[in-house]
Each structure stands twice: as structure tokens, then as C-alpha cells.
């Protein structure tokens, strides 16, 4: 979790002098409770936006927006703490809006936005806006939270972001898999424009079961420049196991930008359809 570096962070608006500060996520009002505290944020919205850095890189960011309730507690509102928690790692990053002037009611509802938290593809976040000072231990909560899942790199808009392109999102291998005679699979895919090796991971399963009955790994050496964007054809030999008929083929590239953590592509071959009619019984029975 980090903040986008592309410009100075501002929260001032007409009628309010405000500055954005780094926060430890542990505001002073936890330790020194105040008697009078503001009410909670209203209409918290989290949206996925895209922003460029000064270097021209494109990153997905969480656009956080909320409004104030129209009650007298804005007289005691000193700022807001914005917290983003990445759910699978428990990593948290906070910033604090510090109001340098008193808020006054005006003809339209106060609205605040912040679009500088960089988020990762396929990650879920809990976004919380706490009004400051925080409430006394038994006071009504004055925060609002929402969970937000970022699309993965297969999403058309995410595909062109820097983190997705770094993990190989622009490569479309267009995998085809066909079953050959004599327990073989023919795998064909399009190479990318980089001289890097690939790995084909074959996992076979019985019909309607999810524990594997055969696994095989096949190494493909780095192609020469004249082979870039060409089709690579590989024939894999299967284990002759009856019923081990559903095959998942996964292609793992090792691009320089993502090494052994690149996006993998896969294709699946289903088991052949079982005939609905029962096997015919022969007219005669052999005697031996």
C-alpha cells in the first residue's frame, strides 16, 4: 500500500483551509478523548479511478468521497482520518485531513474527496473514514467503512495499467489444446515479443473430480527474435490411466518484468462425452 507520488496532496476548498498529513492510524483523540465530537461521515463512496505518475505510469487508485451531515457537530470537526486496509495482508495505510480553519454551514453540503491510495489488481480493501476527534470510549461511532474489490488484470481497463502490464497482461497466448491418438496432447500458443523461457504445466483429473491423477511439467526455451509472435507447438505424452481424462494446461511465462510471478494462462480439455446408450451385449459368448 502506498500513496501516488504525482502531486502535492491538498484538501483545501473554498471556505476551508486544510492540509493532508501522514498518519500512524492512531489519532491523538484515542489517547486523549474529547467531550464534544462530530457525527459520522455520510454517503461514503469508493470508486476505482486511474491516475498517472510524473513518470507517466498508470496506476489504479481508490477514489474516496464522502459528505458531512448537516448538524451542529461540524463546529467540533477538526479533520478526518482516511484508512485503507488490505484484507489479505492486514497492511494498513492512513492519512489525516487536518482542518486549519473552523467549518461553517454554507449553502451546499460539505463534500470531500481523496484519490491518492494506490490499489493492487485483484485485491480487496476496507476503506474507513473517521471524523476527528474520535468519540469517547462509549460514544456513538463517527466513522463509515466500505469494502472494495479491485478487478484483476483480465479486466479491459485494468489490463493497460502499469502493474498489470508489468505482470504480462498484454500477452494473449491464444492457447489451443487438442487430443491426439496414443495418449497425447498437442498444445499450441503464441509467443510474446521477449526472449524468455516458458513452462507448460499439465494437470490431469478424473471426470468430475478435483484431485489430480497426473502432473507433468514441460520447459520451453527462450525463442529467438524471429520467432516472436509465432505459434509454438508442443506435444505432451499423457499417462495411460483409464478415466484420467480432464486436462488443464497452464502456460507460465518468465518475462523480465515479472520473473516467476507473471500472469499464467490456462486452457482445459474436458473428458469425452459418455454415450447415453448402454454397450450392446454380444450375440455369442466366447467359451475361453
Amino acid at each position: 500500500l502506498r500513496l501516488l507520488d504525482h502531486r502535492a496532496l491538498v484538501c483545501s476548498q473554498p471556505g476551508l483551509n486544510c492540509t493532508v498529513k501522514n498518519s500512524t492510524c492512531l489519532d491523538d483523540s484515542w489517547i486523549h478523548p474529547r467531550n464534544l465530537t462530530p457525527s459520522s461521515p455520510k454517503d461514503l463512496q469508493i470508486q476505482l479511478h486511474f491516475a498517472h505518475t510524473q513518470q507517466g505510469d498508470l496506476f489504479p487508485v481508490a477514489h474516496i468521497e464522502w459528505t458531512l451531515q448537516t448538524d451542529a457537530s461540524i463546529l467540533y470537526l477538526e479533520g478526518a482520518e482516511l484508512s485503507v486496509l488490505q484484507l489479505n495482508t492486514n497492511e494498513r495505510l492512513c492519512v489525516r485531513f487536518e482542518f486549519l480553519s473552523k467549518l461553517r454551514h454554507h449553502h451546499r453540503r460539505w463534500r470531500f474527496t481523496f484519490s491518492h491510495f494506490v490499489v493492487d489488481p485483484d485485491q480487496e480493501y476496507e476503506v474507513t473514514v473517521h471524523h476527528l476527534p474520535k468519540p469517547i470510549p462509549d460514544g456513538d461511532p463517527n466513522h463509515q467503512s466500505k469494502n472494495f474489490l479491485v478487478p484483476d488484470c483480465e479486466h479491459a481497463r485494468m489490463k493497460v495499467t502499469t502493474p498489470c502490464m508489468s505482470s504480462g497482461s498484454l500477452w494473449d497466448p491464444n492457447i489451443t489444446v487438442e487430443t491426439l491418438e496414443a495418449h497425447q496432447l498437442r498444445v499450441s500458443f503464441t509467443l510474446w515479443n521477449e526472449s524468455t523461457h516458458y513452462q507448460i504445466l499439465l494437470t490431469s483429473f478424473p471426470h468430475m473430480e478435483n484431485h489430480s491423477c497426473f502432473e507433468h511439467m514441460h520447459h520451453i526455451p527462450a525463442p529467438r527474435p524471429e520467432e516472436f509472435h509465432q505459434r509454438s507447438n508442443v506435444t505432451l505424452t499423457l499417462r495411460n490411466l483409464k478415466g484420467c481424462c480432464r486436462h488443464q494446461v497452464q502456460i507460465q511465462p518468465f518475462f523480465s518484468s515479472c520473473l516467476n510471478d507473471c500472469l499464467r494462462h490456462s486452457a482445459t480439455v474436458s473428458c469425452p462425452e459418455m454415450p447415453d446408450t448402454p454397450e450392446p451385449i454380444p450375440d455369442y459368448m466366447p467359451l475361453w
Epitope: 463512496q45 472494495f148 481497463r157 485494468m158
Partner: nanobody, 127 residues
Framework: EVQLVESGGGLVQPGRSLRLSCAAS????????MHWVRQAPGKGLEWVSG????????DYADSVKGRFTISRDNAKNSLYLQMNSLRVEDTALYYC????????????????????WGQGTMVTVSS
């Protein structure tokens, strides 16, 4: 014109099943997460279920978990809600709704932010 049109509601006995559909038009359906929200007679809105843009993630309210299944067909610009083991308390007007951004607002705290709603389809569960 951006719109969502629900169908499939009706009168059904407790324990039976029903499948709701929602046809989307006027926006790139496969970019956005979608949700089902319901409103029982005389009650407020209750989020029922949500599904991410590529069906990779689905969520359900505790009251329908294990009985309802949300799905989508991006090729047909359609959202579905398969409702099994229906109960009298499932009686409500069911709306499909669109997430306002490309992300997925997960869980029940999201109904206030959805930007496009259908007109609703009525489900009545009664013996």
C-alpha cells in the same frame, strides 16, 4: 439509454424455486459488478447478493446464503438470481442494481451507492 429490466417474479409456495433475470443495456455490462437488492412491504432496502464483473467473486446476505445463487452471462448482458427453498419472509420487490465504478463494493453496506436501478420485480411467497 442506460437501463436495467427485471423479470421472473411471481406468486410461489414456500419451499419452491424461482429464477429472476435482469437485462442490462446502454453501458458496458461486462465492466461492472452487479447486485440484487430487495424491499419487503413496509420495510427498507436490503442488499441480497453481489457478483463481480467476471463472476470471480460472489457474496450473499446471511438471510439467503445457501438458498440463493447469483450468476451473470456477459455475452447476453444478463444478471440472474436463482432462488431455492423460498420462505414467506422472502416476499419483496427485487431490484437489480449496478456498481457505480469498475471495482466491486462487497457486502451489505453498498446499497446507498448503486447508480443504476431497475424498476423491480415482485416475488410473493405464500401458501
Amino acid at each position: 439509454e442506460v437501463q436495467l429490466v427485471e423479470s421472473g417474479g411471481g406468486l410461489v409456495q414456500p419451499g419452491r424455486s424461482l429464477r429472476l433475470s435482469c437485462a442490462a443495456s446502454g453501458f458496458p455490462f461486462d465492466d461492472y459488478a452487479m447486485h440484487w437488492v430487495r424491499q419487503a412491504p413496509g420495510k427498507g432496502l436490503e442488499w441480497v447478493s453481489g457478483i463481480s464483473w467476471n463472476s470471480g467473486r460472489t457474496d450473499y446476505a446471511d438471510s439467503v446464503k445457501g438458498r440463493f445463487t447469483i450468476s451473470r452471462d456477459n455475452a447476453k448482458n444478463s444478471l440472474y438470481l436463482q432462488m431455492n427453498s423460498l420462505r414467506v419472509e422472502d416476499t419483496a420487490l427485487y431490484y437489480c442494481a449496478k456498481d457505480p465504478s469498475l471495482g466491486y463494493c462487497s457486502g451489505g453496506s453498498c446499497s446507498d451507492v448503486f447508480d443504476i436501478w431497475g424498476q423491480g420485480t415482485m416475488v410473493t411467497v405464500s401458501s
